[in-house]
């Protein structure tokens, strides 16, 4: 109780150049506090000086690095101040260039299984950190596989669940410097699929179109699906389209493909918005085939 | 379940002094720190101060310094207030309250005791 | 000390109604704001803790928002049983200080 907390908002991975805000709360209200830094680089600005509840840190640089305490005032401790807090790691990206993060078989992931997450760049990173997306914990740490045209890690993650899913982001670092991190990955979005019984799909005016002929997908569900999501195989990436109740009582959403040039497999899946990386069963793939043309897939 | 359990209503001369007693059960009582509360019709609510239940550690409001004492007694798990010299100024309904967490400060009350300063 | 100012001091409303209570600190606590709800004859309970989240067990209809110095409590639809005395509290630096309190009585 008389130790106190010390966090990081919006969060302990920032990117250079920006801003954050180490908080300390005491449970018995002393709010002056000092700080100070374990390793990496000294930061001049924390010495000597009593903050109030909380500082707002930066614009944050490579040396801003490193791992962060606090001890609150304690008029009752020999020493006017209370045991040090809880270790904060804050981490600086942006200090190398990104690498490139890939899901394995793909970034769509049938509920119970597992999909292997890729991460590597042309930089020889001795470590890489998964970040998802609104989760405030430290990023996982992964030991990278050096090789001569850079790095590589692979992180197998499953068996897939709604809590898993989300918006993955990986960075690099080297091992002397293990708190300075790279610019992010691209996001990739992970997505639960096989929660819910799967919609239907189906091509206006037809499945089978002429070259430059307008054709709408339209995929539907007795479910109260928000969103519905078109993907073509062989494509990353999908369409999306927020669902509206037809006279029928189905939840529909019309895809105008445009002037098609060449055909393929679709399928559609529905979700909600409260669970935005849970969808459902896909729908039974609907091939479109355009005629005309000597492209059919 | 958590519960706080105050000592009865005093009824109490000005100029002497009252001791109001908090019991906690339910929970490890020495895990929690546990906040004094005041309520009066003049001034609504009143934080008096908080006492660690494990290190005795204790943070007054300012205006209470003096007024309040707070203690606690970890083998019965029970925390006291002294309020001295009082006045009818100090008739109130006095709370206990358990913290849950660095963010939630007042999560348990006791069921308060109301005392009555009176010549 | 912060002072938080509290208006209404009272409300009366019918079932049903949507009820809104403001609280402005006199300065900014950034999202350290909880509040409670005192029945008659009972101890304060508390609903709403740092700005938005809800406690324990607090029906959805009770929601709270805000940051800096201005904030919000809402009541969606008011139940019978709501009747009662609202607060809000600055949990930001100690001493800890209270709202003068809504008082929302059912017509």
């Known amino acids: 109780q008389d130790k106190p907390f010390l966090s990081a908002w919006p969060g302990t991975v920032v990117s250079e150049g920006q801003h954050v805000t180490l908080q300390c709360r005491s449970r018995l209200g002393f709010n002056e506090f000092s700080l100070s830094k374990e390793d990496g680089m000294p930061v001049p600005e924390l010495y000597n000086r009593i903050f109030r509840n909380s500082f707002l840190m930066g614009p944050v640089t490579p040396a801003h690095a490193g791992t962060y305490r606090c001890c609150s005032s304690h008029p009752h401790s020999p020493t006017g101040w209370s045991a040090p807090s809880n270790p904060v790691v804050i981490m600086v990206t942006g200090v190398h260039r990104k690498p490139s993060l890939l899901a394995h078989p793909g970034p769509l992931v049938k509920s119970g299984e597992t999909v292997i997450l890729q991460c590597w760049s042309d930089v020889r990173f001795e470590r890489f950190l998964l970040h998802r997306e609104g989760i405030t914990e430290d990023p996982l740490r992964l030991v990278g596989q050096l090789h001569d045209a850079g790095s590589q890690v692979n992180y197998s993650m499953g068996p897939m669940t709604p809590a898993l899913a989300g918006t993955y982001r990986c960075f690099g670092s080297v091992t002397h410097l293990p708190y300075e991190l790279s610019a992010p990955s691209d996001p990739l979005d992970i997505v639960v699929v096989g929660l819910y019984g799967k919609p239907s799909l189906s091509a206006q005016p037809g499945p089978t179109v002429q070259a430059g002929e307008n054709v709408t997908l339209s995929c539907s569900s007795r479910s109260l699906f928000d969103i519905y999501h078109l993907s073509r195989e062989a494509e990353a990436g999908e369409l999306r389209l927020t669902a509206v109740l037809r006279v029928n009582g189905t939840f529909q959403a019309n895809f105008p493909l445009g002037p098609v040039t060449h055909g393929g497999n679709y399928r559609c899946f529905g979700s909600f918005r409260a669970l935005p990386h849970a969808w459902s069963d896909p729908s039974d793939p609907l091939p479109v085939s355009v005629t005309g043309n000597s492209r059919h897939l | 379940q958590v519960q706080l359990q105050q000592s009865g209503p005093d009824l109490v001369r000005p100029g002497v002094s009252v001791k109001i007693s908090c019991k906690g059960s339910?929970?490890?009582?020495?895990?929690?720190?546990m906040h004094w509360v005041k309520q009066s019709h003049a001034k609504s609510l009143e934080w008096i101060g908080v006492?660690?239940?494990?290190?005795?550690?204790?943070n007054y409001n300012q205006k209470f310094k003096g007024k309040a004492t707070m203690t606690v007694d970890k083998s019965s798990s029970t925390a006291y207030m002294d309020l001295a010299r009082l006045t009818s100024e100090d008739s109130a309904i006095y709370y206990c309250?358990?913290?849950?967490?660095?963010?939630?400060?007042?999560?348990?009350w006791g069921q308060g005791t109301l005392v009555t300063v009176s010549a | 000390s912060i002072v938080m100012t509290q208006t209404p001091k009272f409300l009366l409303v019918s079932v049903g109604d949507r009820v809104t209570i403001t609280c402005k600190a006199s300065?900014?606590?950034?999202?350290?704001v909880a509040w409670y709800q005192q029945k008659p004859g009972q101890s304060p309970k508390l609903l709403i803790y740092?700005?938005?989240n809800r406690y324990t067990g607090v029906p959805d209809r009770f929601t709270g928002s805000g940051y800096g110095t201005d904030f919000t409590f809402t009541i969606s639809t008011v139940q019978a049983e709501d009747l009662a005395v609202y607060f809000c509290?600055?949990?930001?630096?100690?001493?800890?200080?209270f709202g003068g309190g809504t008082k929302l009585e059912i017509k």
């Open positions: 006492i660690s239940t494990d290190s005795g550690t204790t």
């Open positions: 509290q600055q949990d930001y630096s100690s001493p800890w200080t």
């Open positions: 309250a358990r913290d849950s967490s660095y963010y939630v400060r007042f999560s348990y």
């Open positions: 740092y700005a938005s």
């Open positions: 300065q900014s606590v950034s999202n350290d």
């Open positions: 339910g929970y490890t009582f020495t895990d929690y720190a």
